[in-house]
């Protein structure tokens, strides 16, 4: 088999026939050096998954539940291409599983016990697996058989396809539990009708159901959605209030050596030639000999899944939690209101050491998880492997786009009620050596630049955003002659100045000596012409305040700030000579962990915060000898956010807009993956 062949897995005679037709028609339109199709027939989707894992086939299209199976070890498959529905201009690759209630009913998600429930059908995704999976640990024990536990949880239900003899309560609202449209409460529209008629109190359906059944907005306004954080929202706010976001139909491949680019090349060309309304001879999204053969008949085309996206991220935390609960059936001993330990994400072994000391001192309240980059940490928080970390504003933006929320802000000024007063922010500045007297904001081209890291506020987003407005392109590595911007591509001129050894060169963590505020300033001291840092960086590393050999003899007077008007000012005049105001660093977490992270961190800062006077003999949460490990070293306290509890509100409209403008220059693979899930 030539290397450019994609071996498609078919699960029936009809699929195999369509696959052969697909193969033959592709041969007729694709040049001989292009991708080709071969067909492999297996007895089931699970057999196809195993065949792909064993390198006997390359691709198959799966529903969400099977994407989960495909991801589990030893299969380790990943999503590579998604089918989309609707229009090319507004492609829908996901649907939202929601819980719909009547507006005046007054209960929340955590008060569903004893209510009457309407389901699309037993074992179906939005109508059963997701809601029951998420409610699993609230069900009365024994939880097996599941139908009995569900019957005992709700006071009555309609769950079409259930066994009405063994579980009569599941058929109480629709006698007989018929498994077809003969049952008026079957399927999406049926479950909604069950709610509408007043038979049930809650209907588990998908987000489009209510729009398909009620054309009139005034009628829709009689209904609300139950959110997982025990609030309610209007039905059109399903993107912010759902049980899970579920991919409709996805092509999977091996994680390693999975031919993902080739599969995309094949399917992209296939949709060009044989997509919706393209050809009479062969139609990719049509099944004359059956239904949904190889691809869904209702699909309109394909979209490439971003490479950073593994199955866990693609399926989303809520969906994975629900399905894992149902499959594994494990719950904490006795669900209590006690907070579980907060799993803090530490960057590389430098932060890990501090985190482990914190963990030991916290006596079980804090646990530590490591990752090599901030983006890897954010991904771990998204999928539940970690719970929280403190982030620069640029990463608060990415985390927010990935569904995380800010929970506490670092405060840098001493005040009486520090914890109650989140600050306006700090200043992003451009520092130069006083001796380089001809250097101004207007003649930085061709100079050597030092950045905290790509994607960070003071070191990247603010200066590069301002620069972008001037040069109108993203080739910052051509603007500066060389530099150190940790997180840049290794072969970029913006890694040339970095000092990390071997694989650590230009890494966005403390293994790279020029990483972070202190690192960027050190880069200026030793090699660079300009450093983009925060207004406190120079005073914190001069006058003997940083005892490291490179810093111990530095003098603040030897450095100056570049002002945007082309002038220069002394370092202490940052208030009148800065690039922009930056939002303070903030702790982020998943929505479901918000309350516990808030509670535990406030306890922890009372034990180990700024009130600890001797940091040589005691653990201090906000100290790490200018290394800014876990938190910035100048943190005085972690402050409540009050109503600034979303990333947009926290960062502010101006900053969100600035980072949004830089999006076209973004190299963030995580941001690309998260905007695929939520454009």
């Amino acid at each position: 088999v030539p290397d450019k062949t994609v071996r498609w897995c078919a699960v029936s005679e009809h699929e195999a026939t369509k696959c052969q037709s697909f193969r033959d028609h592709m041969k007729s339109v694709i040049p001989s050096d292009g991708p080709s199709v071969a067909c492999v027939k297996k007895a089931s989707y699970l057999d196809c998954i195993r065949a792909i894992a064993a390198n006997e086939a390359d691709a198959v299209t799966l529903d969400a539940g099977l994407v989960y199976d495909a991801y589990l070890a030893p299969n380790n498959l990943k999503p590579v291409v998604a089918e989309f529905y609707g229009s090319k201009e507004d492609p829908q690759t996901f649907y939202y599983a929601v819980a719909v209630v009547k507006k005046d009913s007054g209960f929340q998600m955590n008060q569903l016990r004893g209510k009457k429930s309407c389901h699309t059908g037993l074992g179906r995704s939005a109508g059963w697996n997701i809601p029951i999976g998420l409610l699993y640990c609230d069900l009365p024990e024994p939880r097996k058989p599941l139908e009995k536990a569900v019957a005992n949880f709700f006071s009555g239900s309609c769950a079409p396809c259930a066994d009405g003899t063994d579980f009569p309560q599941l058929c109480q609202l629709c006698p007989g539990c018929g498994c077809s449209t003969l049952n008026q409460y079957f399927g999406y529209s049926g479950a909604f009708k069950c709610l509408k008629d007043g038979a049930g109190d809650v209907a588990f359906v998908k987000h489009s159901t209510i729009f398909e059944n009620l054309a009139n907005k005034a009628d829709r306004d009689q209904y609300e959605l139950l959110c997982l954080d025990n609030t309610r929202k209007p039905v059109d706010e399903y993107k912010d209030c759902h049980l899970a976001q579920v991919p409709s139909h996805t092509v999977v491949a091996r994680s390693m050596g999975g031919k993902e680019d080739l599969i995309w090349e094949l399917l992209n060309q296939a949709q060009e030639h044989f997509g919706k309304d393209k050809s009479k001879e062969f139609q990719l999204f049509s099944s004359p000999h059956g239904k949904d053969l190889l691809f869904k008949d209702s699909a309109h085309g394909f979209l490439k899944v971003p490479p950073r996206m593994d199955a866990k991220m693609y399926l989303g935390y809520e969906y994975v939690t629900a399905i894992r609960n149902l499959r594994e059936g494990t719950c904490p001993e006795a669900p209590t209101d006690e907070c579980k330990p907060v799993k803090w994400c530490a960057l590389s072994h430098h932060e890990r050491l501090k985190c482990d000391e914190w963990s030991v001192n916290s006596v079980g309240k804090i646990e530590c998880v490591s990752a090599e980059t901030t983006e890897d940490c954010i991904a771990k928080i998204m999928n539940g492997e970690a719970d929280a970390m403190s982030l620069d504003g640029g990463f608060v933006y990415i985390a927010g786009k990935c569904g995380l929320v800010p929970v506490l802000a670092e405060n840098y000024n001493k005040s009486d009620n520090c914890e109650d007063t989140p600050e306006a922010g700090y200043f992003a500045i451009a520092v130069v050596k006083k001796s380089a007297s001809d250097l101004t904001w207007d003649n930085l081209k061709g100079k050597k630049s030092c950045h905290t890291a790509v994607g960070r506020t003071a070191g990247w987003n603010i200066p590069m955003g301002l620069l972008y407005n001037k040069i109108n392109h993203c080739r910052f590595d051509e603007f500066f002659s060389e530099g150190c911007a940790p997180g840049s591509k290794k072969d970029s001129s913006l890694c040339k100045l970095c000092m990390g050894s071997g694989l650590n060169l230009c890494e966005p963590n403390n293994k790279e000596g020029y990483y972070g505020y202190t690192g960027a300033f050190r880069c200026l001291v030793e090699k660079g012409d300009v450093a983009f840092v925060k207004h406190q960086t120079v005073p914190q590393n001069t006058g003997g305040k940083n005892p490291d050999p490179w810093a111990k003899n530095l003098n603040e007077k030897d450095y100056e700030l570049l002002c945007l008007d082309g002038t220069r000012k002394p370092v202490e005049e940052y208030a009148n000579c800065h690039l922009a105001r930056a939002p303070n660093h903030a702790v982020v977490t998943r929505k479901d962990k918000e309350a516990c992270v808030h509670k535990i961190l406030r306890q922890q800062q009372h034990l180990f915060g700024s009130n600890v006077t001797d940091c040589s003999g005691n653990f201090c949460l906000f100290r790490s000898e200018t290394k800014d490990l876990l938190f910035r070293d100048d943190t005085v306290c972690l402050a409540k956010l009050h109503d600034r509890n979303t990333y947009e509100k926290y960062l502010g409209e101006e900053y969100v807009k600035a980072v949004g403008n830089l999006r076209k220059c973004s190299t963030s693979s995580l941001l690309e993956a998260c905007t695929f899930r939520r454009p």
């Epitope: 072994h349 430098h350 050491l353 501090k354 482990d356 000391e357 030991v360 001192n361 040589s616 003999g617 005691n618 653990f619 790490s624 000898e625 290394k627 490990l629």
Partner: nanobody, 114 residues
Framework: QVQLVESGGGLVQAGGSLRLSCAAS????????MAWYRQAPGEQRELVAA???????TYADSVKGRFTVSRDNAKDTIDLQMNSLKPEDTGVYYC????????WGQGTQVTVSS
């Protein structure tokens, strides 16, 4: 600055024992937190065992009951006694400490063959 130097690594059969030692270049009495980490190929460094200056001990779940950490302020060492070794204990073992600054050793290789 404190230099940390690990010794005692080597190749051992599953079920066997090794004692790793970490010697500091100066007094460890000012170090609040001393720990042993290990790193398997392609994995993150993970905490194996640690001791605080107040005598609080902690162990990774995977080594509880098999490994013992002991700190000797007089000799300026921290040792890790490893018994009932398993192939999954294989990796580079690093000594680390926190005081006025953070300190790491260069590591010593431990290989447990089955």
């Amino acid at each position: 600055q404190v230099q940390l130097v690990e010794s005692g690594g080597g190749l051992v059969q599953a079920g066997g024992s090794l004692r790793l030692s970490c010697a500091a270049s100066r007094s460890i009495s000012t170090l609040r937190f001393m720990a042993w980490y290990r790193q398997a190929p392609g994995e993150q460094r993970e905490l194996v065992a640690a001791e605080t200056s107040a005598g609080r001990l902690t162990y990774a779940d995977s080594v509880k009951g098999r490994f013992t950490v002991s700190r000797d302020n007089a000799k300026d060492t921290i040792d890790l006694q490893m018994n009932s070794l398993k192939p999954e204990d294989t990796g580079v073992y690093y000594c680390a400490a926190r005081g006025l600054a953070d300190y790491w050793g260069q590591g010593t290789q431990v290989t447990v063959s089955s």
